[in-house]
């Protein structure tokens, strides 16, 4: 009776361990007696020649697949063989692929790190992940490792990284998707610029003269604030692009410096003075503005 | 399953507005981007734009801008589209379809909206 | 806007017959990052429409191995092997590589 290989489990996953044990025919004497060793496909394995009928195989992975078998040698150097056994091994297909933003929620400001994580659930043995920007898919990054995450890094956010993305996670049965995620670049706003507008070259007392405020940059909603030599006058949300205007109707009161502020909760700017200065001409002439 | 259930047909008058909604289930509806589709009687397809239901962000077609308002509730899963000053044109089918990234296909329609506009 | 022709308008065929379609689009649809985003959609009356091949030439899963599609660039074809009564209704052909997307105006398979 020849040797006995037994592998245990008989059919292993990816991933996990492997024992062989090489059984001596119960005619045989002790197993003290012999020097085995452990083959795969005409390669030995482990140690090579040892006193122990047994070798663990930490790590199975899919190309560990083959033909096995044990050989144990007697001090008087007869050689016994094992019959071979066919190990395959199975690969566990990916399968729940996410994506998930760091920072979390997908928003970022501009200038910092952005990294997309992509993860499966489930898969064995090398993985190849791909990152998309954009719901029809412009291929960023391509990764293959053997571990059930991959990151990709934007390390400096910019205004243009704002998009839809998704990953791709493939082990050889099939891509599979992620959902898709959308990337918020918050951008702080410039500082912004005050105009006025006046209904005539020379405004008098009583016309409506309309000072805008924008921040040409910044994330939306902006909060603009108008000034006359710091104080008050009003507020004014602008949704999307375009700034603000406020409308003030001139009395003799409003010579003096304006300036309005930007702020989008991301920082506040105030925007440069302006002056805007009224003579007072004698007679029935009304008052001019000039700036 | 996956299932895009669509509101009841609409009969509205010239000049008015209506709201069509897309009601998402057997899927996260985050994940995907949801696109609507007009079909005038006897005739053939357009596509008005998509809206990606995560963040609410919308996508037109610059031939319905102004004519229409795509928006999304997470909350509900569903996703809805407003035709505005409506005129006997936008008569039509309405159907919303998810499409599927990587693969890029619509997969899932729904059974659409019939919108009459009559004084 | 990208426009897309589809001939014939109108399809007769008997049962069992091949049935092609074509579809012509006024500029190359091949995308910038490679691909080429054309998909056959059947609508049936009263129906909405549904996927039969994406990307030019995969059919989608579920569909029969009867239906084949082909092409590149600004050329494209439906091929019918075998028309079974069940494949009766409008043909669509889309292109989803250049916003506004676009469909052709509809190819309508019938019995002859």
């Known amino acids: 009776a020849g040797l006995l290989l037994i592998v245990s489990p008989s059919h292993p996953t990816e991933g996990s361990p492997v024992n062989l044990t090489c059984k001596m025919p119960s005619l045989q004497s002790s197993d003290a007696q012999f020097q085995f060793c452990f083959f795969r496909d005409d390669q030995a394995l482990g140690p090579g020649w040892s006193s122990s009928p047994k070798l663990q195989i930490a790590n199975m992975w899919k190309e560990d697949s083959g033909s096995y078998w044990c050989e144990a040698q007697t001090m008087a150097s007869k050689v016994l063989r094992s019959w071979r056994s066919q190990i395959n091994v199975h690969r566990v297909p990916v399968a729940d692929v996410s994506l998930e933003t760091q920072p979390p929620g997908g928003q970022v400001m501009e200038g910092d790190r952005l990294v997309l994580i992509c993860s499966v659930a489930m898969g064995t043995g090398d993985i190849t992940f791909l990152w998309y920007k954009g719901a029809i898919g412009l291929n960023l990054q391509t990764k293959t490792q053997r571990s059930l995450t991959a990151e990709y890094e934007i390390p400096t956010a910019r205004e243009s990284d704002a998009e839809q993305y998704y990953c791709v996670a493939e082990n050889g049965y099939g891509p599979r998707p992620s959902g898709l995620v959308s990337i918020t670049v918050r951008i702080p706003v410039s500082r912004p610029i005050l105009m006025v507008r006046a209904p005539r070259a020379q405004a008098v007392v009583g016309d409506v003269l309309k000072l805008h405020c924008e921040a040409l940059r910044g994330s939306h909603p902006i909060l603009y604030w108008f000034y006359h030599e710091d104080v008050i006058l009003g507020s004014s949300s602008a949704p999307s692009g375009g700034g603000a205007s406020f409308n003030l109707s001139l009395t003799a009161e409003h010579s003096g410096n304006y300036s309005c502020e930007a702020n989008n909760g991301l920082g506040a700017q105030r925007s440069e003075e302006v002056t805007l200065n009224f003579t007072v001409p004698t007679g029935a002439r009304s008052n001019h503005l000039t700036s | 399953q996956v299932q895009l259930q669509q509101s009841g047909p609409e009969l509205v008058k010239p000049g008015a507005s209506v709201r069509i909604s897309c009601k998402a289930s057997?899927?996260?509806?985050?994940?995907?981007?949801i696109h609507w589709v007009k079909q005038r009687p006897g005739q053939g397809l357009e596509w008005i734009g998509w809206?990606?239901?995560?963040?609410?962000?919308?996508k037109y077609n610059e031939k319905f801008k102004g004519k229409t308002t795509l928006t999304a509730d997470k909350s509900s899963s569903t996703a809805y589209m407003q035709l505005s000053s409506l005129t006997s044109e936008d008569s039509a089918v309405y159907f919303c379809?998810?499409?599927?990234?990587?693969?890029?296909?619509?997969?899932?329609w729904g059974q659409g909206t019939t919108l009459t506009v009559s004084s | 806007d990208v426009l897309m022709t589809q001939t014939p308008l109108s399809l007769p065929v008997s049962l069992g017959d091949q049935a092609s379609i074509s579809c012509r689009s006024s500029?190359?649809?091949?995308?910038?990052?490679?691909?080429?985003?054309l998909e056959w959609y059947l609508q049936k009356p009263g129906q909405s429409p549904k996927l039969l091949i994406y990307?030019?030439?995969n059919r989608f899963s579920g569909v029969p191995d009867r239906f084949s599609g082909s092409g590149s660039g600004t050329d494209f074809t439906l091929k019918i092997s075998r028309v079974e009564a069940d494949d009766l209704g409008v043909y669509y052909c889309?292109?989803?590589?250049?916003?506004?997307?676009?469909f052709g105006g509809g190819t309508k398979l019938e019995i002859k």
């Open positions: 500029q190359s649809i091949v995308h910038s990052n490679g691909n080429t985003y």
């Open positions: 990307k030019v030439s």
């Open positions: 889309f292109q989803g590589s250049h916003v506004p997307w676009t």
């Open positions: 379809a998810r499409r599927i990234h990587y693969y890029d296909y619509f997969d899932y």
């Open positions: 809206i990606y239901p995560g963040d609410g962000n919308p």
């Open positions: 057997g899927y996260t509806f985050t994940s995907y981007n």
